[in-house]
Amino acid sequence: QSPIFGPQDVSSIEGNSVSITCYYPDTSVNRHTRKYWCRQGANGYCATLISSNGYLSKEYSGRASLINFPENSTFVINIAHLTQEDTGSYKCGLGTTNRGLFFDVSLEVSQVPEFPNDTHVYTKDIGRTVTIECRFKEGNAHSKKSLCKKRGEACEVVIDSTEYVDPSYKDRAILFMKGTSRDIFYVNISHLIPSDAGLYVCQAGEGPSADKNNADLQVLEPEPELLYKDLRSSVTFECDLGREVANDAKYLCRKNKETCDVIINTLGKRDPAFEGRILLTPRDDNGRFSVLITGLRKEDAGHYQCGAHSSGLPQEGWPVQAWQLFVNEESTIPNSRSVVKGVTGGSVAIVCPYNPKESSSLKYWCHWEADENGRCPVLVGTQALVQEGYEGRLALFDQPGSGAYTVILNQLTTQDSGFYWCLTDGDSRWRTTIELQVAEATKKPDLEVTPQNATAVIGETFTISCHYPCKFYSQEKYWCKWSNDGCHILPSHDEGARQSSVSCDQSSQIVSMTLNPVKKEDEGWYWCGVKEGQVYGETTAIYVAVEERTRGSPHINPTDANARAKDAPEEEAMESSVREDENKANLDPRLFADEREIQNAGDQAQENRASGNAGSAGGQSGSSK
């Protein structure tokens, strides 16, 4: 008895495809060893046709694949464009030779079945429309026309020219003639269902002088496309249902017994299990759309179907496309936190993993929005301007070679709660979803900046201090000047570092930053933060206003930007953010990254000079820890 199992007999017809699944015992050795498909010869030798090592024989070139699914302990051999020459005895097996563990499979490929003379074969997918062509002689031009379906010896009328329509074809069948043609009539049957398959006879006239045509209708349910994805990665279902349903609502559903549960549709329905990790994106005006799901879970594996119907729900007789999704638990994508918690006024540092082989790829961070189809406008990127409403409080820190980048968001409000995606313009599997939960703060923040009303005067010296608690004693403290392309670290002076850690005085742990002399371009947002190596921690932000001191004029503070940052609701900024993005509603963020890159290019030279000046404090010798 072989421990390998599969179909003993497989039968198909010429031109068709087969997908043969072989099951093997679930052991580590079996999961990783060579899988093969070979043809048994009369001499007892089994000639390899395809193997998981990459071998592909000449006769299978361009028409076969072998996919291993270690998570399911199966491998699948797909063979397309079958011919009668493919009929024979095969083995699917495991091992370095073709004598290892195997299972015998018999494949029989038949000719397309013979039908009565003059039978026209129509092959259509479920939900589509077939047009059956019926020829007749001039003598029957004014006679009754009909189409009937063979059921055993009987032939039951489907439709005729007296306007009779069988109830099961009501609103689906029409009989018509085109133009001035006097020798052909046509029957359209739309919204095809599996039970429509069979042999049809069309007839013009009655009795022995009647003209008859045979039509064989084959209605195919779409063969699911196999998708094999890693745990925590993402999958895109590309759905192309054709122009005839371009204006109907679209959906993606997951099969459950004989029903199909809608996951998302264009009418606003969305399964809560996919909240924050799904996007439906129309691709063009011809009804093409795609559905992207990120953060794949083991339970996401299954049989998916996309379709279209005005109700946004699956309906029999409407076109569909199908996929079988397998989720591999042996994932290359690291397990990262799926929920990050913060408090109002505080900050979060979110670590985004990416494919370490693609360290030069552009990194992005977007905010998933639960409009009807889901959308994810980019908030920040390695070469993307920070979105309006996030100035001074959002930055992306790339750590080339580490396989991760960090996104810091500070001055948190409860409105920041929601789902965010990490993505790159490289390997699309590496998209991760993070849920940010912001609760109301119950205590003072760990980092506090003084003075809070920060106004510097051009030409003078300006020092700003950041107070930190003893728990941050051993961490690296830094000041950075925020700009649209990140937060550039500045030289700073750590007052607390002079003390021994034993006698840490909670009140005197200070890291300060001095601007000397102050320049107009020093105006802007500054961050005080802590980090350990490449791991970023808490940050706080302050806006430094710069003004000219005119002789004799009183010193008046400008509008307090810091108070605005801490207290003001963000509706205004949000509104403008939405306005900017409304035309990009459902685009993959990568598609408009280039546009932001162009906007950003002009800012960089100026920013680099400014951050250099900001750190040119007189008599200061860089950062001390």
Epitope: F5, V10, S12, I13, V18, S19, L220, E223, E258
Partner: nanobody
Framework: QVQLVESGGGLVQAGGSLRLSCAAS????????MGWFRQAPGKEREFVTA??????????YYADSVKGRFTISGDNARNTVDLQMNSLKPEDTAVYYC?????????????????WGQGTLVTVSS
């Protein structure tokens, strides 16, 4: 809802033949799996054979214990499946269940079928 009704069970002598039928009423599918399982008195239910329709092709699976003796056939347009049992042995005595799965995927030997019939008794006397 899909209903499965088995027929054809009965008493037969060892070495004899029997043909079981299963009819599925309800929605028609062009892609699904139908199988036969059996349960002998005091034993676990076990896989016997299955037939899978997918993409215009037909796949037939058999347990080692029935290979060469039992043949599964079916008509997916009519939602019926038959089991021809030849060279019957006393150890084939069991209640035979018809099962249907509305997806062509998954191990046909598994219990993850969506619908099950009530069963028909096959007794093979020696």
């Amino acid at each position: 809802q899909v209903q499965l009704v088995e027929s054809g069970g009965g008493l037969v002598q060892a070495g004899g033949s029997l043909r079981l039928s299963c009819a599925a009423s309800g929605r028609a599918f062009s892609q699904y799996t139908m199988g036969w399982f059996r349960q002998a008195p005091g034993k676990e239910r076990e896989f016997v054979t299955a037939i899978r329709w997918s993409g215009g092709s037909i796949y037939k699976y058999y347990a080692d214990s029935v290979k060469g003796r039992f043949t599964i056939s079916g008509d997916n347009a009519r939602n019926t499946v038959d089991l021809q049992m030849n060279s019957l042995k006393p150890e084939d005595t069991a209640v035979y269940y018809c099962a249907a799965r509305m997806s062509p995927w998954g191990d046909p030997r598994g219990n993850e079928y969506d619908y099950w019939g009530q069963g028909t008794l096959v007794t093979v006397s020696s």
